[in-house]
């Protein structure tokens, strides 16, 4: 019988504990948020707020500039100086809660916890391939604002998610921020609202259009908004809430909220509930029927998928997917199954199931006792009917209202279950060729890019590497940066390459050569690298 | 009636550059965005960048973000655009046109008379 | 950039026909759309804006219609000084851009 090369498990074909040192920043505290920066010139920033400092950081996360964003009252504060002599409001910390770039000026705005959730902008001045802020501007005018009624509070120190879109010669500030009755109480940030942006960069025009958690609803009933998106013609906002208004408050889910991004009105509001299952292929006895639900997201991010990927969700290359991590419950913690599980929901798709709710509410015959739903906002209603009204009248028409669709979007875990232990805390989706790439930070401080594939038993690894020794967590915001992405763990930025901070993992020449195409990996003598870390022999095309 | 008048034509060698003037009349300069839009003979309309008078903030259109300067004398209530490198091909009339919000919508209400611009060697 | 493309690009027509204009954006714009006619050696004219509503003086034979991608401007009836080249401009995103007109000539 013939001899053969003893064939080398998968596993035992990359070593995940080789040590990989990415470029870094210091931050000097918790980063609180985390944005950047490519100007049409080739200048780009990072910018990195921690409490009471925004950081300006070049592409090298050299610092350029650094900035005092608090406390509050403390004649050190930069930014609070714009607001002219004081004082504004209690003394006291300045978390950042929003910072946010509005691409039409171009300028960076930051809001914090501090001084009624106010906003300030930072017009940015670009010199060489760096970029520089100006001195901010104060987004608060004073006589415009009262406790129950004030256009530039903007932030909530529960939590603040803001996307900017340009609308004529201004630019509408999508807001969506968590309240409670003590926060809904003192100068009320409101659930969700579109702002306009004053041209004379004094705050927001009076008089926006809210939605607003009922004032009997918002001591049980809080929404967590976990992500917040811009793609076609809608402005998307995640949550996390109480799955009934009436029912256990405990009993969380998700919903994605949809925003017109061309009219700044909230008449076509609608929500949808997310559903995403554990489906193992192998079904144990009492499991449910669908499979194991995991109703809680914990990240998102929406990305044009790769032609496999594409396929596989039969859908076009290229088109819009979002895609979440969902966890058993707010602690995320052990269950049955995987700790996180991944799943992807086409933009197309959602936007089609959202219209086919709006026909079932609006086009007659309406289904007897289908309701209109989002009782936290509005009054109780059945379709086709306006909320608290029994009827439609004549100059009314069913579409104008806001509205939750009576079904949900149900998928499965893309990984199937493979994640196992590893708990999912960041999430940034690319297409590199025709791949499609999950880059994962995790609780441990850890990254994973993996592939995202459905039909595979095993998970196609780029790289699955430890960001450094603390193992504090990967924060949710990842911001990328030409080829790199930012990753935040505990007071650091790093600086990942998309394509995989390099080869050393993979530990055979079989294993190395089978590598992506985009990794740029090749057998040197007895290791795995990229051309660049060999100075002899470097071969793609075969092994010794 | 609001009015918006603009400085006479003007003929420049390629290489040069041309500065045309906007006086605003019957409303308050500073409260209202002010555009400038041209057109080549014989062609559509081009818009080439704006310009917010109370803070001087300016937007301009890529295609000439390099030699487009617009400006703003408040006190003369006179917007300003300086196209600088002509070459034959910016040959067109230059209009100012102020844009107002009617309701949530924007649009270009008042439009200046025209200036040509005539780029020859 | 957003491309309006704006058809026919000139039409002859007699006095009292109904003229309809259409004009396609390359992606969504809402209602951000304003309608403008020029007669010549002058400058444009403010016609409709917000795709639907007539701008002040405006006679109320101009209407415009549409939402999204795809508008359209009509004259019911046809008048003489109704003669000129009509405009449609996008105001959603900058840069804004216009289309590349209509010429409404007497047949």
């Known amino acids: 019988e013939d001899w053969q090369c003893p064939r080398t498990p998968y596993a035992a074909s990359r070593d995940f504990d080789v040590k990989y040192v990415v470029p870094s920043f210091s931050a000097g505290g918790l980063v609180q948020a985390m944005v950047t920066y490519e100007g049409d010139r080739n200048e780009s920033a990072v910018f990195v707020a921690i409490r009471n400092r925004l950081h300006v950081l070049g592409p090298d996360l050299k610092s350029v500039q650094s900035l005092a964003t608090g406390p509050a009252g403390d004649p050190g504060c930069q930014t609070c100086a714009a607001c002219g002599p004081g004082p504004h409001g209690p003394p006291g910390d300045t978390d950042t809660k929003v910072l946010v770039l509005d691409p039409a000026l171009p300028a960076l705005v930051s809001c914090g916890s501090s001084l009624q959730g106010r906003c300030f902008l930072h017009d940015l001045e670009p010199q060489g391939t760096a970029v520089h802020l100006a001195a901010p501007a104060c987004l608060f005018s004073a006589h415009h604002n009262r406790p129950d009624d004030c256009p530039d509070c903007v932030a909530s120190p529960l939590g603040t998610r803001v996307t900017v879109v340009e609308q004529g010669q201004a630019s509408y500030f999508y807001v969506a921020s968590s309240l409670d009755a003590a926060v809904a109480a003192s100068f009320s940030p409101r659930s969700v609202s579109i702002r306009r942006l004053k041209a004379d960069a004094s705050g927001f025009a009076p008089g926006f259009v809210a939605l607003s958690v009922l004032p009997k609803h918002l001591v049980s009933y809080s929404i967590e908004y976990v992500h917040s998106f811009h793609t076609g013609a809608f402005v998307y906002f995640l949550t996390v809430q109480p799955a009934s208004v009436t029912d256990d408050p405990s009993a969380l889910h998700t919903r994605l909220a949809r925003l017109s991004a061309t009219e700044p009105e909230l008449g076509d509001y609608r929500e949808l509930v997310l559903d995403c299952r554990f489906a193992p292929k192998r079904r144990r006895r009492g499991a449910p029927e669908g499979g194991q639900p995991y109703p809680v997201l914990r990240v998102a991010h929406s990305a044009p998928v790769g032609a496999q990927l594409a396929t596989e969700l039969s859908i076009a290359e290229g088109q819009e997917v979002l895609f979440g991590v969902f966890v058993t419950g707010k602690d995320g913690g052990p269950g049955v199954g995987p700790n996180s599980v991944v799943c992807a929901f086409p933009i197309d798709l959602l936007d089609t199931l959202i219209d086919e709710g709006v026909e079932r509410c609006c086009e007659s015959p309406v289904h007897p006792g289908l309701r209109r739903g989002l009782d936290f906002f509005q009054s109780p209603s059945f379709c086709p009917n306006p909320p608290g009204l029994e009827a439609l009248s004549p100059n009314t028409s069913c579409r104008h209202f806001p509205l939750l669709v009576s079904s949900s979007f149900s998928r499965v875990d893309l990984f199937n279950g493979l994640l196992g232990p590893v708990q999912v805390t960041a999430l940034y989706v690319t297409r590199l060729d025709n791949v499609t790439v999950a880059h994962m930070g995790t609780m441990d401080g850890r990254i994973l890019q993996v592939e995202l594939v459905r039909s595979l038993n095993y998970l196609l690894y780029v790289s699955n590497f430890s960001l450094g020794d603390s193992g504090q967590p990967v924060q949710r915001d990842v911001s990328r940066l030409g080829d790199h992405l930012l990753f935040a763990s505990g007071d650091q930025v790093f600086q990942v390459p998309i394509q995989g901070p390099g080869c050393r993992h993979f530990l055979t020449c079989g294993r190395c050569l089978r590598a992506w195409h985009f990794m740029g990996c090749g057998w040197c003598g007895n290791m795995c690298g990229q051309q660049k870390e060999c100075p002899g022999s470097w071969q793609q095309d075969h092994c010794p | 009636q609001v009015q918006l008048v603009q400085s006479g034509a003007e003929v420049k060698k390629p290489g040069s550059s041309v500065k045309v003037s906007c006086k605003a009349s019957?409303?308050?300069?500073?409260?209202?965005?002010m555009n400038w839009v041209r057109q080549a003979p014989g062609q559509g309309l081009e818009w080439i960048g704006r310009?917010?008078?109370?803070?001087?903030?300016?937007r301009y259109n890529e295609k000439f973000r390099d030699r487009v300067t617009i400006t703003a004398d408040k006190s003369t209530s006179t917007a300003y655009m300086e196209l600088s490198s002509l070459r034959s091909e910016d040959t067109a009339v230059y209009y100012c046109?102020?844009?107002?919000?009617?309701?949530?919508?924007?649009?270009?209400?008042?439009w200046g008379q025209g200036t040509t611009v005539t780029v020859s060697s | 950039d957003i491309q309006m493309t704006q058809s026919p690009s000139s039409l002859s027509a007699s006095v009292g026909d109904r003229v309809t204009i259409t004009c396609l954006a390359s992606?969504?714009?809402?209602?951000?759309l304003a309608w403008y006619q020029q007669k010549p050696g002058k400058a444009p004219k403010l016609l409709i804006y917000?795709?639907?509503s007539l701008a002040d003086g405006v006679p109320s034979r101009f209407s415009g219609s549409g939402s999204g991608t795809d508008f359209t401007l009509t004259i019911s009836s046809l008048q003489p000084e109704d003669f000129a080249t009509y405009y449609c401009?996008?105001?959603?995103?900058?840069?804004?851009?216009f289309g590349g007109g209509t010429k409404v000539e007497i047949k």
């Open positions: 019957d409303y308050t300069l500073t409260d209202f965005y």
């Open positions: 992606q969504t714009i809402g209602t951000w």
């Open positions: 401009q996008q105001l959603y995103n900058t840069p804004w851009t």
């Open positions: 917000a795709a639907t």
């Open positions: 310009i917010y008078p109370g803070t001087d903030k300016t």
């Open positions: 046109a102020r844009s107002a919000y009617y309701g949530n919508y924007v649009a270009m209400d008042y």
